[in-house]
């Protein structure tokens, strides 16, 4: 999906009002400097691409983020403020239902959410170019 035409300010507002708190709640108990920041993004569409990938694509050691509160709110924000996004996700969602596993917070998931916090932080930068 091409995130170029999203309403970035509305997505930012959704992040600041709720998603950020849910990420904080998920990370509760984690040491500040436990994880190195290794994932980056250069502009807002790129940030959203990386955010979507880390949030919804299962990775080795972390298959369970998509059902977390922050993930569901991220999905809702993208569906509302990115034209055509929800249509592209129908097949992905059906595939995800087949893979659905019980919720387990692994260290790998915590590391992944730490990277997500960094990506969201970059997305929110006021001077970050949109294209």
């Amino acid at each position: 999906y091409d995130f170029t035409n999203c309403d970035f300010e509305k997505i930012k507002a959704a992040y600041l009002s709720t998603i950020s708190k849910d990420l904080i709640t998920y990370m509760s108990g984690t040491k500040s400097t436990e994880f190195n920041n290794t994932v980056s993004c250069s502009n807002r569409p790129h940030c959203l691409t990386e955010i979507q990938s880390l949030t919804f694509n299962p990775t080795a050691g972390c298959a369970s983020l998509a059902k977390e509160m922050f993930a569901m709110k991220t999905k809702a924000a993208l569906a509302i403020w990115c034209p055509g996004y929800s249509e592209t996700q129908i097949n992905a969602t059906q595939a995800m239902k087949k893979r659905r596993k019980r919720k387990v917070t692994t260290n790998k998931c915590l590391e992944q959410v730490s990277q997500l916090q960094g990506l969201w932080r970059r997305f929110n930068r006021p001077l970050l170019k949109q294209q």
């Epitope: 904080i24 509760s28 984690t30 500040s32 400097t33 916090q117």
Partner: antibody, heavy 118, light 107 residues
Framework: QVQLVQSGAEVKKPGASVKVSCKAS????????MHWVRQAPGQGLEWMGE????????DYNQNFRGRVTLTVDMSTSTVYMELSSLRSEDTAVYYC???????????WGQGTLVTVSS | DIQLTQSPSFLSASVGDRVTITCKAS??????VAWYQQKPGKAPKLLIY???MRHTGVPSRFSGSGSGTEFTLTISSLQPEDFATYFC?????????FGQGTKLEIK
């Protein structure tokens, strides 16, 4: 182990600028954020701003925006805090402090006293 | 910005006493609160993070609790080295803010 070593005390006249350094060691410099916090004599702690050494992006406390500038020298793993248009109420100890993506401060510099006096 | 109000501002106590310091936030900060101890002429030292987690090397007599808008730091049995100033800090929302401090003095 992580170490943050700050430059020495400064005495400045009102209206002048001051530049305080914070040299980091013991970790990957670009992996974490560096913050600055100040404390006026007998007062509480006030967060001033942060810099991401990986790309020099800064965020400032609205109270200081326009007067404070954070910069980084990658070659020496040093962060600088410059405060301009100094006034007597800027007399304080200035600390650098380190965080990851979660913003509580588990590592601090030793502090730099800046005195603004005519 | 989120305001943090600490109480009391000053506290006199004796060695062996149990003391509690309160920090109230102007809005919900989940459990994103840290506590620091500061001695004269020194940088603050992290005691507690995530409202209740003790930092490495912090004695077990220090404990934290709370969530939402009300948080407490408790020292179960004061030791001579505990007389210092204590600050709470919230990291739930930008800009990061501190309480005004509680100075703990020997009675």
């Amino acid at each position: 182990q992580v170490q943050l070593v700050q430059s020495g005390a400064e005495v400045k006249k009102p209206g002048a600028s001051v530049k305080v350094s914070c040299k980091a060691s013991g970790y990957t410099f670009t992996s974490y954020l560096m913050h600055w916090v100040r404390q006026a004599p007998g007062q509480g702690l006030e967060w001033m701003g942060e810099i991401d050494p990986s790309d020099s992006y800064t965020d400032y406390n609205q109270n200081f925006r326009g007067r404070v500038t954070l910069t980084v020298d990658m070659s020496t793993s040093t962060v600088y805090m410059e405060l301009s248009s100094l006034r007597s109420e800027d007399t304080a100890v200035y600390y650098c402090a380190l965080t990851g993506t979660i913003n509580y401060f588990d590592y601090w510099g030793q502090g730099t006293l800046v005195t603004v006096s005519s | 910005d989120i305001q943090l109000t600490q109480s009391p501002s000053f506290l006199s106590a004796s060695v062996g006493d149990r003391v509690t310091i309160t920090c109230k936030a102007s809005q919900d900060v989940v459990t994103a609160v840290a506590w620091y101890q500061q001695k004269p002429g020194k940088a603050p030292k992290l005691l507690i993070y995530w409202a209740s987690m003790r930092h490495t090397g912090v004695p077990s007599r220090f404990s934290g609790s709370g969530s939402g808008t009300e948080f407490t730091l408790t020292i179960s049995s004061l030791q001579p080295e505990d007389f210092a100033t204590y600050f709470c800090q919230q990291y739930s929302s930008f800009t990061f803010t501190f309480g005004q401090g509680t100075k703990l003095e020997i009675k």
